[in-house]
Structure formats: structure tokens, C-alpha cells
Interface confidence: low
């Protein structure tokens, strides 16, 4: 039985050219996390594997940094980065938990929501 829940940074916004942290947290379960996948729509951005560590998709390596923790840092944001991001927790014995974050990248300093998740 899957008892866990995923908490995420929810809907967040950031300024073009800036950076932001995408963060998910799995709680209310004792299941072991074996791997976390970070995906943007249908693209795999990064994997954090319990045995192998982090692997960033080479096409994003210049703009994506692992962490903090199991989160993901997006840098040099562009308007094209706007969209849905998913953290997919593979756990044993529970199975798969998925969290959703919506990121909006804004042209100007209208990015007040989620500002606390931004990197100065």
C-alpha cells in the first residue's frame, strides 16, 4: 500500500536569465528511494540514482545542476523553460510517486511567486 505523499514547490515563477531550484520531498513513507527522475514534459532532464549518483542529460548539462539534495537547479532560464516539471520517485517497496511543478519564466521582474526558491 502506498502511503507516501510528495510535496513540491508547486507553481513557481522566475525571471529570464535567472536560476531556480525545483524541489520535491517524499514524506509519510518508510520506503527506500532507489532513484529520482526529473522530467520536463516528455524529456528526461536528470536522474539521481542511489547507487550511481547523478546523471544530467548532456543536452542540459550547461544549464542544469544537481541538488540541493534530490532537487534540481535550473540556470540561465529562458522563456522556453516555461512548463511542467515532474519529479518521479522510484521507491521500494511502494513503487512510483510523482510530483508536479509548473514553472513560468517571465521577461521582467514580475516574478514574485516562488521568489523564495530562487538563487540570488
Amino acid at each position: 500500500m502506498m502511503t507516501g505523499t510528495i510535496e513540491t514547490t508547486g507553481n513557481i515563477s522566475a525571471e529570464k536569465g535567472g536560476s531556480i531550484i525545483l524541489q520535491c520531498h517524499l514524506s509519510s513513507t518508510t520506503a527506500q528511494v532507489t532513484q529520482v527522475n526529473w522530467e520536463q514534459q516528455d524529456q528526461l532532464l536528470a536522474i539521481c540514482n542511489a547507487d550511481l549518483g547523478w546523471h544530467i542529460s548532456p543536452s542540459f548539462k550547461d544549464r542544469v545542476a544537481p541538488g540541493p539534495g534530490l532537487g534540481l537547479t535550473l540556470q540561465s532560464l529562458t522563456v522556453n523553460d516555461t512548463g511542467e516539471y515532474f519529479c518521479i520517485y522510484h521507491t521500494y517497496p511502494d513503487g512510483t510517486y510523482t510530483g508536479r511543478i509548473f514553472l513560468e519564466v517571465l521577461e521582467s521582474s514580475v516574478a514574485e511567486h516562488g521568489a523564495r526558491f530562487q538563487i540570488p
Epitope: Q35, L44, I47, N49, L52, G53, W54, H55, P66
Partner: nanobody, 117 residues
Framework: EVQLVESGGGLVQPGGSLRLSCAAS????????MGWFRQAPGKEREWVAS???????WYADSVKGRFTISADNSKNTAYLQMNSLKPEDTAVYYC???????????WGQGTLVTVSS
């Protein structure tokens, strides 16, 4: 000593196919990923595709739908099936691998692929 040895390059006509192989030896552990990069004359080396030990694959936009990367973990060998080749695919293709997360740890010597009529 770790070695990556590429094979399968050659001359092919536009629209043709080639299959590159990369045999890795000397690893204490299986590489966490293996991949292919290429360098065309007078250009920077660019990433083409990579495959994780768990089977996940990534492709550069320029080769999506035409190239397929795969790996035989038991043999520590990666393959790049290249279909619908174009003259702009002409380059030296390099195999690369990584044992831990971070930078690419190992590189092959490269194999030349020429697409020309």
C-alpha cells in the same frame, strides 16, 4: 587500463546507414553511462546520444528519429545505429563513458564517418 575502442565508421551515401560499436574494457565497474559525441571538420565536438546503464536514452535534436543508441551491459559495449544519414553527419565519432557522476571520464580515439555521394 580502461580502453574504449570504436569501430564501424566508413564512407556511406546520403540516405544510407551505418552501425558504430564501442567496446569498453578495463573497467572495475560497469560504466554508469556510455555515449557518442562527434566532431566535424573545423567545428567543436558535440554530443550526439547517450545511454544509461538502466536503459534510459538521450539524443541531440539533430539526430532524433534517425539515430538509435543501445548498450549491451554484459559486454560493456555501446552501439549507435545511424539511419537516413546526411552529408552534415560527416564527422569523427567518439565514444565516451562515465563511471561516476560528473565529467566524462573516458574517451575513445574516434572513428570517421563520411556521408557523400
Amino acid at each position: 587500463e580502461v580502453q574504449l575502442v570504436e569501430s564501424g565508421g566508413g564512407l556511406v551515401q546520403p540516405g544510407g546507414s551505418l552501425r558504430l560499436s564501442c567496446a569498453a574494457s578495463g573497467f572495475t565497474f560497469s560504466p554508469s553511462w556510455m555515449g557518442w559525441f562527434r566532431q566535424a571538420p573545423g567545428k567543436e565536438r558535440e554530443w550526439v546520444a547517450s545511454v544509461l546503464r538502466g536503459g534510459y536514452t538521450w539524443y541531440a535534436d539533430s539526430v532524433k528519429g534517425r539515430f538509435t543508441i543501445s548498450a549491451d551491459n554484459s559486454k560493456n559495449t555501446a552501439y549507435l545505429q545511424m539511419n537516413s544519414l546526411k552529408p552534415e553527419d560527416t564527422a569523427v565519432y567518439y565514444c565516451a563513458s562515465e563511471v561516476a557522476s560528473g565529467e566524462t571520464d573516458y574517451w575513445g580515439q574516434g572513428t570517421l564517418v563520411t556521408v557523400s555521394s
